[in-house]
């Protein structure tokens, strides 16, 4: 802190502003009958240079000029950007206790003079706006500078505005407080910017608008649609505007989608009709607006209006597939599956379905509502039956879907040949197989159908399956494949009163099992031994088991097991060996192979033959 | 929010002449155009003169046709004062003068356009008797 200067003065020469690589004189300059005593050469004055509060240097080699004990002049050079204190001090060479007393200070500042301010562009934002413009300042001056828009419009009229940049603060746009109205469309206005600190000063060459070129409507407001006569297809979609309005631009898209519906409507008055919507289907509507067919720019867009199209009757053909059960000599379950309709095709809420089983001779009829997806009933054994499912939302149901009730897999000759299940990757299966030999009818369609391998899944779980048309001959099934899981695959061929279908079974993945299968027990029937198991828990199979493997060896032998090699079927849980030596006693023991590989060995049974082997 | 206030008129014989005075107060600024209006019974109200004084010193300055040579327009920024010296008075000069201040929307009449300015002053009437 400087104490209001009572000892003396510091001045500058040429001036405490200076441009960047000028030098300064500092003079130093003490009161009269202010010093360090009645000897004036005993007064000695020093100059320090403080940059952010920090000493950085004592200029005492710097002095050009030294009246003794009265006054001293430094000279500094390569002063930096910015502002730098000095500060003179007092020494008093008599007394060295004492530290320097200050006698006065002075801020150096040192900048460049203003550029020229380039790039202005004004905007008045919707027709009651004001005039706002801005501009490059160029670079950094390091002073206060002062800057001046100025506009100029017809009728010599005139307006300016003022700001300055500083080191706390930016100075590169201005609001006029002026509004341009409408009927001045076809005047040019002109702006400049002037900038002025201590160094000097500058122009901006002069900027020429029209209205047109800077005044930006407001984006419309109030936006709503009304759909006529509860359309799901028609609406029409209103708003308010600014008066001056001629060109609108309308976006409208559904949430989920990545592409905007683009629309201009020209003298559109708050006003407009889509025809092309998709019913029950929730969209996003914008609108911008423009002062002129071909000048001018667009608004921003508006806020977004969000909102559901009505229901319309839903459109599309249900796939339907079915499951035949006989419960006794008379009596079959029939169960009826059906796919959702897609939200395109069901165009609403579906609340129900409507299903039908019509016995085709008798004239029987069987009809219920259900909001489920599937539907089983009881039905005789007897007779020529058909299914019908229809889907129905607030504005009605969609055409009935037909199917004729068949034995799925009654004709051989209908059976599809060569079927093969191989993984493509993580979560699909490639089927292929090749068409019946020698079937009396045409097929009509091929229905690929899947199911996991897991206890229960017949009950639990519905089926999952495609509609193949009769000329292709393979699918790639994906719908709920995981890794590591078995599916039973069967593909159908259909003609118009039979059926007739190969199974086979394929996986996604695989590894090797986890564990091998659980004997449960060993019994000896005519000579021959029967090995028991259990088979391996699901989640443990790791995919479709290909065959098991029985191994069997003396006890205490050091010598390679023997084994025998069953293909795998899920309902066969034991096997017969018999080449065991009676009165021997055997270790034996079971693993299961995937096409990844062998699982370890399961439990181990120790058994010995009584009978005559073979 | 500014407030104007006009004073000086009266009555005078045709070749008179009328000094009229604003007096503006609340958030004065030399910064704006000011401006004098008359309106004569049963006809629109026109612009009559204007003043323009800028941060850069100087100012601009607007007569109607019908008034030049013949009027003047000036302020002292220190009194916040707009003066209208009105010379060779006739009869047509006879109205209601109002003082106003803050050209915030421009039309195409310019500084001439009443709906342009922010601020008015309740009037002073001025009377020319031949």
């Known amino acids: 802190n400087i104490d209001v200067c009572k000892l003396g003065t510091v001045t500058v020469q040429p001036a405490p502003v200076i441009p960047l690589g000028s030098a300064a004189n500092i003079s130093c300059s003490l009161n009269p009958k202010q010093g360090c005593s009645h000897y004036p050469s005993s007064n000695e004055l020093i100059l320090l240079k403080f940059v952010n509060d920090v000493l950085v240097e004592n200029l005492h080699g710097k002095k050009v000029h030294d009246h003794t004990g009265h006054s001293s002049t430094f000279q500094v050079t390569n002063l930096s950007l910015g502002m730098t204190l000095f500060v003179c001090k007092l020494n008093c060479s008599n007394s060295q206790k004492k530290p320097p007393v200050p006698v006065c200070g002075v801020e150096i500042s040192v900048g460049v003079a203003p550029e020229p301010p380039q790039n202005i562009s004004c905007v008045q934002e919707g027709e009651n706006g004001t005039v706002a413009c801005s501009w490059n300042s160029g670079k950094v001056t390091y002073l206060k500078t002062n800057y001046t828009l100025q506009l100029s419009g017809p009728n010599n009229l005139t307006c300016q505005k003022q700001c300055f940049s500083d080191n706390r603060q930016n100075c590169n746009r201005l609001d006029l407080g002026i509004n341009l109205s409408p009927d001045l469309a076809e005047s040019r206005f002109i702006v400049r910017v002037t900038a002025i600190n201590d160094l000097g000063n500058s122009s901006s060459l002069p900027h020429t608008f029209t209205f047109l070129d800077i005044v930006i409507p407001l984006p419309p407001w109030d936006i709503r649609i009304n759909f006529l006569n509860a359309s799901g297809s028609r609406g029409t979609l209103q708003w308010e505007d600014e008066g001056q309005v001629v060109l609108n631009q309308l976006r409208y898209q559904p949430l989920n989608s990545t592409s905007w519906n683009m629309v201009n409507a020209t003298n559109a008055k708050g006003k407009y009709d889509l025809r092309d919507l998709r019913p029950f289907t929730e969209y996003e509507f914008q609108i911008s607006s423009k002062l002129h067919l071909s000048g001018g720019s667009w608004s921003n867009w508006s806020e977004s209006l969000r909102t559901r199209t009505p229901e319309e009757e839903p459109v599309g053909i249900l796939d339907i597939w079915y499951m035949k059960q006989d419960i006794d000599y008379d009596r079959q379950q029939i169960s009826l599956f059906w796919k959702s309709l897609n939200p395109s095709e069901a165009r609403g809420k579906i609340l129900h379905y409507q299903v039908t089983l019509q016995e085709v001779t008798k004239k029987t009829t069987l009809q219920n509502t259900t909001r489920h997806t599937s539907w089983t009933r009881v039905i005789p054994r007897t007779g020529a039956w058909t299914a019908s499912v229809s889907a129905a939302n607030s504005k009605g149901a969609s055409a009935p879907t037909h199917i004729n009730i068949v034995d799925l897999c009654g004709t051989g000759l209908l059976a599809p040949h060569q079927v093969s299940a191989k993984s493509e990757n993580m979560d699909n299966i490639l089927v292929t197989w090749q068409p019946p030999k020698k079937a009396d009818s045409a097929v009509r369609e091929y229905i690929v159908e899947w199911r996991a391998l897991q206890p229960g899944s017949i009950t639990k779980f519905p089926p999952h399956w495609l509609r193949i048309p009769p000329d292709n001959m393979s699918a790639l099934i994906s719908e709920n494949i995981k890794p590591y899981i078995c599916y039973e695959i069967r593909v159908h061929a259909l003609s118009e009163s039979q059926g007739g279908c190969s199974s086979i079974r394929g996986d996604s993945k695989h590894k090797a099992p986890v564990s091998g299968p659980h004997i449960t027990a060993i019994t000896e029937k005519k000579e021959r031994l029967f090995i028991s198991w259990t088979h391996i828990p699901f989640p443990e199979q790791r995919g479709c088991i290909l065959h098991y493997r029985i191994y069997w060896k003396e006890r205490d032998s050091t010598a390679q097991p023997e084994l025998c090699e069953i293909q795998y079927r899920r309902s066969q849980n034991s096997h017969p060996i018999s080449s065991l030596q009676p009165r021997v006693t055997y270790v034996l023991w079971m693993t299961a192979v995937t096409a990844a590989g062998e699982s370890p060995q399961g439990n181990e049974r120790e058994f010995c033959p009584q009978g005559k082997a073979n | 929010q500014v407030q104007l206030q006009e004073s000086g008129g009266g009555s005078v014989q045709a070749g008179g002449s009328l000094r009229l005075s604003c007096a503006a107060s609340g958030a004065t600024n030399s910064n704006r155009h000011m401006g004098w209006f008359r309106q004569a019974p049963g006809k629109e109200r026109e612009g009559v003169a204007a003043?323009?004084?800028?941060?850069?010193?100087?100012?601009?300055?607007y007569y109607a046709d019908s008034v030049k040579d013949r009027f003047t327009i000036s302020q002292d920024n220190a009194k916040n004062t707009l003066y209208l010296q009105m010379n060779s008075l006739t009869p047509e000069d006879t109205a209601m003068y109002y003082c106003?201040?803050?050209?915030?929307?421009?039309?195409?009449?310019?500084?001439?356009?009443?709906?342009?300015?922010?601020?008015w002053g309740q009037g002073t009437q001025v009377t020319v008797s031949s």
């Open positions: 106003a201040a803050d050209l915030t929307r421009w039309y195409s009449g310019g500084w001439r356009d009443p709906r342009g300015y922010k601020y």
């Open positions: 003043i323009y004084t800028g941060y850069t010193g100087g100012g601009n300055t």
